[in-house]
């Protein structure tokens, strides 16, 4: 069986301030078991945007229903975009671990650019 890939098909997305951004991400396999997380930026200072396993993120909704056992679409929508949301967003697959899940594979990233509202 081929190893899971995390696919972010959009290199960049341009969204007007105040609108909703859709960041697309799919996995090619259900294996290994473990959650998806979305981050803005890379490295130790990256910002958690969405965590499938824990918490509620009021501005973030998933495009598909992640409670479905066979779901492999981890795309998200971020509402009410502001210029502060600009950056590169990474969809990251984690492998279930004990006590902590282990980062397994990251998508290539999607750069979100924000167009100012015309005044």
């Amino acid at each position: 069986e081929e190893e899971l890939q995390v696919i972010q098909p959009d290199k960049s997305v341009l969204v007007a301030a105040g609108e909703t951004a859709t960041l697309r991400c799919t996995a090619t396999s259900l294996i290994p078991v473990g959650p998806i997380q979305w981050f803005r930026g890379a490295g130790p200072g990256r910002e958690l945007i969405y965590n499938q396993k824990e918490g509620h993120f009021p501005r973030v909704t998933t495009v598909s229903d992640l409670t479905k056992r066979n779901n492999m679409d981890f795309s998200i929508r971020i509402s009410n975009i502001t210029p502060a949301d600009a950056g590169t967003y990474y969809c990251v697959k984690f492998r279930k671990g004990s006590p902590d899940d282990v980062e397994f594979k990251s998508g290539a990233g999607t750069e979100l650019s924000v167009r100012a509202k015309p005044s």
């Epitope: 499938q52 824990e54 918490g55 509620h56 992640l66």
Partner: antibody, heavy 120, light 107 residues
């Protein structure tokens, strides 16, 4: 076999405290968010509090906020509910339940409940 | 908080009958609506998750549908063991909320 066993219920006077426990077995406790739900006699279900698998995210119903504290010890496979400043309206059967992964998931296993009676 | 309103509050039906219970949400919960069955003195049991998915081990006579604000639980042919109270519950956003329950009684 998945098992959730609540304990710690009883009769307590208004204003006093009580700590409920929920012992989990038959599954990897640290993978699951956990919930407390209560049911007053003859009434419906009311969500009380929830805690994520690593305790990073905790939420409370407005009716218990500031009085109840949910916590967990993953090394002991145990969930807790510390209840302070108890009121007559807290009288209920308290259930613990588990929730797989994120916030949107349902409560797929429940304990049998422990009765808390607040009365002078 | 999102309010859930179940209808009817109680229902008398006969074995073999088809029964429908509805749950309305005060705002959209997308598909994050779940249904539970509770018998007297027992803990609730998950029947349907995320609007239409049958939980493992639950008989196929139970089905769910809906999205947004309107949801339905259907029992295609009532069996004696189905007489119980049914609750809907949303998990779209905190706080989690339950409907007030629908008590299904034998006619």
């Amino acid at each position: 076999e998945v098992q959730l066993v609540e304990s710690g219920g009883g009769v307590v006077q208004p204003g006093r405290s009580l700590r409920l426990s929920c012992a989990a077995s038959g599954f990897t406790f640290s993978d699951y968010g956990m919930i407390w739900v209560r049911q007053a006699p003859g009434k419906g279900l009311e969500w009380v509090a929830s805690i994520s698998s690593s305790s990073s995210y905790i939420y409370y119903a407005d009716s218990v906020k500031g009085r109840f504290t949910i916590s967990r010890d993953n090394s002991k496979n145990t969930l807790y509910l510390q209840m302070n400043s108890l009121r007559a309206e807290d009288t209920a059967v308290y259930y613990c339940a588990r929730r797989y992964y994120g916030f949107n998931y349902p409560f797929d296993y429940w304990g049998q409940g422990t009765m808390v009676t607040v009365s002078s | 908080a999102i309010q859930l309103t179940q209808s009817p509050s109680s229902l008398s039906a006969s074995v073999g009958q088809r029964v429908t219970i509805t749950c309305g949400a005060s705002k959209s919960v997308r598909t994050y609506m779940h249904w539970y069955q509770q018998k007297p003195g027992k803990a609730p049991k998950l029947l349907i998750y995320s609007a239409s998915n049958l939980e493992a081990g639950v008989p196929s006579r139970f089905s769910g549908s809906g999205s947004g604000t309107d949801f339905t639980l259907t029992i295609s042919s009532l069996q004696p063991e189905d007489f119980a109270t049914y609750y809907c519950q949303q998990s779209n956003e905190p706080p989690y909320t339950f409907g007030q329950g629908t008590k299904l009684e034998i006619k």
